[in-house]
């Protein structure tokens, strides 16, 4: 058993049929010694008396809010949550496996630049009695500070018969060094509590591996005289790290016909313009990627050819 | 060329070669997600590699003030990786084909380090840990770790030379 926060405790249980469970001793936070009784949740049934209460925690029915009273007055509470371990593996019932970039990916994180600011998100099908708390650091043995906000519900989607809820959190490294080569990964830890079930999820990454620039901005076409060619120009996104002579991007320009089956013409360039042939009903799209490190491409910025 | 005394390197040549290094490093190990190398028990090699750290002067302001600290750090790293890529970690099983980018990568590391430090001048270099893993899986794991680490190192070096070529070239 360990303390998650004040008056909230997590009991770690090996979860299998007829498991013996864990013996837990609760102590009433009071100077009183006599006349103390214990109850669980809203029940008025007295579970025991005395300053301490010993219970055998085996299942969710044994978890909940234990309260000690004296003469009708509440003295203190202890909330017990369960953390299940099945076949040596901690349960992951609360969050959905996003399966990208690999199986058992519950948390996904992205950064728009090298400033040390990043966003993580996760999915669940649970709509109520759900709380999250997020902590982060750079490195684990001698951790350097990363400050995370509160997790918020950022999107709701309908998937078949199920509703899916996306939560996200923003974090910022306290003393970020955008130009340095990271040697210690960022660690993100999410505590999830659904009713009386506790789970924790972690992710470990370098900012450089989660970079995904915003799409290029101000995408414009300039027709070239007496030609089917156009000059496409664009600019670096505002959110990208500066100076651009140091934090450079590379770009992919694509001409795509109306039908998905039509052949796509692609050009790669380090410049912020390119000359392409504009076909009728086609559209021109441009996306960006870090020039020197192959992290994710941005989403496409697009304009119609006409 | 950068000499310990402090003249400027051939920024544009260094820029071109460092960008080529980035491409080669990603050709040699293009996979990001196929195995989480940090879960696989950290070998000493990748802990001991020279990283370009915050105080090394490789940020735009540091380069403007005095690029020598940064160039020395980059040179140290190039020599370190060049020795690693030439070691028996990259020979033996699993077999690398003769078209492997590792050969070109090795040569380009040497080429860039020579651009930064012509013969006759000597910056301190870092000892490479002596590692000769006997099992193919240990060797492959080390290769992947070294290449992932090299990708990060050459990315910073390429930014330095690109910025230098754009703002510090005579």
């Amino acid at each position: 058993i360990w303390e998650l926060k004040k008056d909230v405790y997590v009991v770690e249980l090996d979860w299998y049929p007829d498991a013996p469970g864990e013996m837990v001793v609760l102590t009433c936070d009071t100077p009183e010694e006599d006349g103390i009784t214990w109850t669980l949740d809203q029940s008025s049934e007295v579970l025991g008396s005395g300053k301490t209460l010993t219970i055998q925690v085996k299942e969710f029915g044994d978890a909940g809010q234990y309260t000690c009273h004296k003469g009708g007055e509440v003295l203190s509470h202890s909330l017990l949550l369960l953390h299940k371990k099945e076949d040596g593996i901690w349960s992951t019932d609360i969050l959905k496996d996003q399966k990208e970039p690999k199986n058992k990916t519950f948390l996904r994180c992205e950064a728009k630049n090298y400033s040390g600011r990043f966003t993580c998100w996760w999915l669940t099908t649970i709509s109520t009695d759900l709380t999250f708390s997020v902590k982060s650091s750079r490195g684990s043995s001698d951790p350097q500070g990363v400050t995370c906000g509160a997790a918020t519900l950022s999107a709701e989607r309908v998937r078949g018969d199920n509703k899916e809820y996306e939560y996200s959190v923003e974090c910022q490294e306290d003393s970020a060094c955008p130009a340095a080569e990271e040697s210690l990964p960022i660690e993100v830890m999410v505590d999830a509590v659904h009713k009386l079930k506790y789970e924790n999820y972690t992710s470990s990454f370098f900012i450089r591996d989660i970079i995904k620039p915003d799409p290029p901005k101000n995408l414009q076409l300039k027709p070239l005289k007496n030609s089917r060619q156009v000059e496409v120009s664009w600019e670096y996104p505002d959110t990208w790290s500066t100076p651009h002579s140091y934090f450079s991007l590379t770009f992919c320009v694509q001409v795509q016909g109306k039908s998905k089956r039509e052949k796509k013409d692609r050009v790669f360039t380090d410049k912020t313009s390119a000359t392409v042939i504009c076909r009728k009903n086609a559209s021109i799209s441009v996306r960006a990627q870090d020039r020197y490190y192959s992290s994710s491409w941005s989403e496409w910025a697009s304009v119609p050819c006409s | 060329r950068a000499v310990p005394g402090g003249s400027s390197p051939a920024w544009t040549q260094c820029q071109q070669l460092s960008q080529k290094l980035c491409t080669l490093a990603w050709s040699a190990h293009p996979l990001v997600g196929h195995m989480d190398l940090r879960e696989e028990g950290d070998e000493e090699t990748t802990n001991d590699v020279p990283h370009i750290q915050c105080g090394d002067g490789c940020d735009p302001q540091g380069l403007r003030d005095n690029s020598q600290f940064c160039l020395q750090r980059i040179h140290q790293g190039l020599i370190f990786y060049e020795k690693l890529l030439g070691s028996d970690i990259f020979t033996g099983e699993p077999s690398l084909l003769p078209d492997s980018p590792v050969g070109q990568l090795h040569a380009s590391l040497l080429g860039l380090s020579q651009l930064l430090q012509p013969e006759g001048h000597h910056w301190e270099t870092q000892q490479i840990p002596s590692l000769s893993p006997s099992q193919p899986w240990q060797r492959l794991l080390l290769r992947f770790k070294i290449l992932r680490s090299l990708q990060a190192f050459v990315a910073v070096a390429a930014r330095v030379f690109a910025h230098g070529a754009a703002t510090l070239s005579p």
Epitope: - | H34, M35, P94, P98, P136
Partner: antibody, heavy 120, light 107 residues
């Protein structure tokens, strides 16, 4: 895009030779090794060897040494595999293939295969 | 030479079934193992390399696992178009060698 086009099916007499070609396009021919495999009817695959066109250096599976000669013609971006002293057990589909660019031999692109039948 | 012992040599399963094919290397090949699919009369097609990395465009129902000597190809939910021969292949050591193949049919 990368393409490997092999020569057509051949019927040969025991003791004779056959030369199968593999014309490559869509990439720089001298940049990558070209490998040859064979698959006897209803059987698995066997790796025969490769040629690295940049320096014309072949490498063979010991089991095929003396039986096979692999060459390359840079001017036409074509690799060749010649089988000599043919016997009935050489009847198989022969494939050329090129691996991933990272320098390890998992084969991404394959020729369409050439059936060589050895029969008297 | 490294032997790649593949099993079973043939198997019949129903659409939607989970199918597992195994390959055992006669010595350590790290994760230098690929899996190929070959449909009747067609060319082998790369499915998995580095033991577990799906090649571009390969459906997510195909997955690979294993390291050193024991490797597995899994099809999580068999589809009619998965009828084919499947081969494992080690590219750790010369000469590169292949498993003898598994013929997969639909019940």
């Amino acid at each position: 895009q990368v393409q490997l086009v092999q020569s057509g099916a051949e019927v040969k007499k025991p003791g004779s030779s056959v030369k199968v070609s593999c014309k490559a396009s869509g990439y720089t021919f001298t940049d990558q090794t070209i490998h040859w495999m064979r698959q006897a009817p209803g059987q698995g695959l066997e790796w025969i060897g490769y040629i690295y066109p940049r320096d014309d250096s072949p490498k063979y599976n010991e089991n095929f040494k003396g039986k096979v000669t692999i060459t390359a013609d840079k001017s036409t971006s074509t690799a060749y595999m010649e089988l000599s002293s043919l016997r009935s057990e050489d009847t198989a589909v022969y494939y050329c293939a090129i691996p991933d660019r990272s320098g390890y031999a998992h084969f991404i692109y394959w020729g369409q295969g050439t059936l060589v039948t050895v029969s008297s | 030479d490294i032997q790649m012992t593949q099993s079973p040599s043939s198997l019949s399963a129903s659409v939607g079934d989970r199918v597992t094919i195994t390959c055992k290397a006669s010595r350590d090949v790290a994760i230098a193992v690929a899996w190929y699919q070959q449909k009747p009369g067609k060319v082998p097609k790369l499915l998995i390399y580095w033991a577990s990395t799906r090649h571009t465009g390969v459906p997510s129902r195909f997955s690979g696992s294993g390291s050193r000597t024991d490797f597995t190809l899994t099809i999580s939910s068999l589809q009619p178009e998965d009828v084919a021969d499947y081969f494992c292949h080690q590219y750790s050591s010369y000469p590169f060698t292949f498993g003898s193949g598994t013929k997969l049919e639909i019940k």
